[in-house]
């Protein structure tokens, strides 16, 4: 019996005979060594990183890794062009800006190029595997006398993100959080003068553009209360 | 251990429809890819469809909008349903599984496959 694997255009291309003989009538025939499995992150759309562990081969292998994108302009097979290397051993590939298509099925093709027979071939929707870069230039106004607005920006399409802010005082032992939507600004309706209070967010490429499940870093953090300075009350920048 | 069983198949005429179940004993299915396979007498096996266990779902281009794949992790179970049926969709249907640590492995290749089920004939009449 031989394996397929699936070309740009959608068909199959016979490869090799890959799995023992009683393959599949034996419900439970196992394949031979597999390949480590790849995963990809888009990081804010700049470029992303398709690693895999490396460390897992039962000898030092130089995997290679090609990719297209099924049913699309792009369905030309492409090797890595920029690989990256743990331990002088590949171990993943960088693709740039222009080489990434979020909305078109990324199929991604590992190989033994010492045993060629030897492949995977994974699909991903690379809208799911965007992380965006943490939120920056947190500010805080006061509002009144009791309510504070925290706002921030992002280095990417503000509607195509969600957020996550946590915030506490020095008095409380854990963060409470709050979601908010792609408006990137938080109020917080009733503040207590005499507490210093921290403030961080985190950001997610959900739900609007995609069902990314990962958060970005937490942002630097940003503090409104009594240990800060009194010169400008309505108006607090970020401290580092 | 993995085991799998499918079935579902059946004869049918052209247009009509079929649901093919593959369920698993011996272990959840909550961390393993799962992918549908095909293989027509005197024809290699082709891939179907296949998924992710964090629920992303991929389609060969020969069944893309007529046949879904879905998964009910409550009941280990995995399934394929055939809408708007065609001869030459005629083969063994085979199910199979891989473990994977990513939520986002998908595998349209057989050989990444560690375990396979017996095959469900699925014969459609002109």
């Known amino acids: 019996l031989n394996t397929t694997i699936l070309t740009p255009n959608g068909n199959e291309d016979t490869t090799a005979d890959f799995f023992l003989t009683t393959m599949p009538t034996d419900s439970l025939s196992v394949s031979t060594l597999p390949l480590p499995e790849v995963q990809c992150f888009v990081f804010n759309v700049e470029y992303m990183n398709c690693t895999w562990n490396s460390s897992s081969e039962p000898q030092p292998t130089n995997l290679t890794l090609h990719y297209w994108y099924k049913n699309s302009d792009n369905d030309k097979v492409q090797k890595c062009s920029h690989y990256l290397f743990s331990e002088e051993i590949t171990s993943g590939c960088q693709l740039q800006k222009k080489e990434i298509h979020l909305y078109q099925t990324f199929v991604v093709q590992l190989q033994d190029p010492r045993e060629p027979r030897r492949q995977a071939t994974q699909m991903l929707k690379l809208q799911n595997l965007v992380i965006p870069w943490a939120p920056e230039n947190l500010t805080l106004h006061k509002l009144s006398e009791s309510q504070l607005e925290l706002n921030w920006n992002n280095r990417f399409l503000n509607h195509c993100l969600e957020h996550l802010v946590q915030y506490r005082t020095d008095w409380d032992h854990s963060w409470t959080e709050q979601s908010v939507d792609y408006r990137h600004k938080f109020s917080l309706p009733s503040v207590d003068g005499q507490k210093r209070y921290t403030f961080r967010v985190r950001s997610r490429f959900n739900p609007l553009c995609g069902s990314a499940q990962h958060w970005s870093e937490w942002s630097h953090p940003i503090h409104w209360g009594s240990n800060t300075s009194k010169e400008n009350p309505f108006l607090f920048a970020l401290e580092a | 251990q993995v085991q799998l069983v499918e079935s579902g198949g059946g004869l049918v005429q052209a247009g009509g429809s079929l649901r093919l179940f593959c369920a698993t004993s011996g272990r959840t299915l909550s961390r393993y890819a799962m992918g549908w396979f095909r293989q027509a007498p005197g024809r290699e096996r082709e891939f179907v469809a296949c998924d992710s266990w964090g629920g992303d779902t991929f389609y060969a281009d020969s069944v893309k909008g007529r046949f879904t794949f879905s998964r009910d992790s409550a009941k280990n179970t995995v399934y394929l349903q055939m809408n708007s049926l065609q001869p030459e969709d005629t083969a063994v249907y085979y199910c199979?599984?891989?473990?994977?640590?990513?939520?986002?492995?998908?595998?349209?290749?057989?050989?990444?496959?560690?375990?396979w089920g017996q095959g469900t004939q699925v014969t459609v009449s002109s």
């Open positions: 199979a599984a891989a473990p994977t640590s990513f939520a986002t492995t998908a595998y349209s290749s057989s050989n990444s496959y560690a375990y």
